[in-house]
Interface confidence: low
């Protein structure tokens, strides 16, 4: 195989969770390299992952400029010993990607919980994103606002019948039976989306009259 033989990239796929966004493709290159370009408008291309032998490229910094914009990337194939020429190398375009609509919601973490009498209070950790404004990072709630809901699935520890509660904050306060232990998990939901509406469910936590151990953090939570 000559060094000028290149294969056009295929299976271009966006992998994105809480706005951390990576473009993946195939195949592994032999004697050639890839350059990724990304643009919110076809033709105004920005180079990323220049002359790489990887088959993935982190484009988070670029898509963060405007998470409601629609982006297209393309993967260009160059011979490994290439010199820059005016000739355009072969390339493949990605599917369009709109971060605000298309990024997957990450698994939520239950920050804390407490059962007092007939009330169960559950707080979801305010997940940070990689959306950066002036060098600092926004929380999921800051980006999605009221579009972001959380669903709490809860059930008596002694039974399997699940109940459901929803909030557009990061806190739940629900009525439970006094003296009963409860188990629960949470899920992030964006109801206005057509796809990628729901996150994976969080780890399950359970209350106890003395204490419960969070499997997420390994720390002890004390309860009444």
């Amino acid at each position: 195989t000559g060094t000028t033989d290149v294969i056009v990239a295929y299976n271009l796929t966006w992998k994105s969770t809480n706005f951390k966004t990576i473009l993946e493709w195939e195949p592994k290159p032999i004697n050639y390299v890839y350059t990724v370009q990304i643009s919110p408008r076809l033709g105004d291309w920005k180079n990323k992952c220049f002359h790489t032998t990887d088959t993935e490229c982190d484009v988070t910094d670029e898509i963060m400029r405007n998470v409601k914009e629609t982006y297209v990337a393309r993967v260009l194939s160059y011979p490994a010993d290439t010199v820059l020429t005016a000739q355009e190398p072969p390339f493949t375009n990605s599917p369009p990607f709109t971060p605000y609509l298309d990024t997957n919601l990450g698994q939520p973490v239950i920050q804390s919980f407490e059962q007092v009498g007939t009330k169960l209070n559950v707080t979801v950790e305010a997940a940070r994103t990689l959306v950066r404004v002036n060098g600092t990072f926004l929380r999921l709630r800051d980006v999605f606002g009221k579009d972001l809901n959380y669903t709490l699935y809860y059930w008596r520890a002694s039974s399997t019948g699940k109940k459901k509660a929803t909030t557009n904050t990061n806190e739940f306060l629900i009525d439970v039976d006094k003296g009963e232990n409860y188990c629960f998990s949470v899920q992030a939901v964006i109801p206005s989306r057509r796809v990628n509406q729901k996150s994976p469910e969080s780890r399950i936590e359970c209350t106890s009259q003395e204490k419960a151990v969070s499997r997420e953090t390994g720390h002890h939570h004390h309860h009444h």
Partner: antibody, heavy 124, light 108 residues
Amino acid sequence: QVQLQQWGAGLLKPSETLSLTCAVYGGSLSGYYWSWIRQPPGKGLEWIGEIGASGSTRYNPSLKSRVTISVDTSKNQFSLKLSSVTAADTAVYYCARDTPYYYEGGYYYYMDVWGKGTTVTVSS
Amino acid sequence: EIVLTQSPGTLSLSPGERATLSCRASQSVSSSFLAWYQQKPGQAPRLLIYGAYSRATGIPDRFSGSGSGTDFTLTISRLEPEDFAVYYCQQAGVVPYTFGGGTKVEIK
């Protein structure tokens, strides 16, 4: 270097509305969270609430029904309003910048810039 | 609400001595969101430690933070005259963000 300058009425009667403003000099409102904290005479610090870069707000539930925090990006200012004040609202009120910081895979969150404080007294 | 309990309320020490301040949370707190502040009379609080362990810009290395879960500690290895002040811990992980009641470090 970012500095916060705050001002507002220092003496109020019960049932009036406390109104304070904090101006950001040497930096932008964008990308940070902006908090109000108060400290009653001889006591500790109490977080009142914050406004985020996107305009989203979070309030202390104990004050939520009376508090409004707003932002004016054109003036690089944010403001606190606390309605129906009583003597229990007498305190030094501070504005502060909350900085979320990402480093080596972890997030940190802290108040790194503070105003000098405004003494507010509620008395009939 | 996460309650932060600081102890002791007052610490009477001499310059050059070691100060150990405790902050205990009513529920587990992510160390990423635990900070320590110093406050002197008539002044605003000043950030000392963030992320439970990291010194803020310009803070001398005699200040150090440690701990995790529900128990956190601020240590001043050798007290300087300017270190006599009130120290507060704060959690910023769960709304409402809360401060401890403070520990006053005074000259013995």
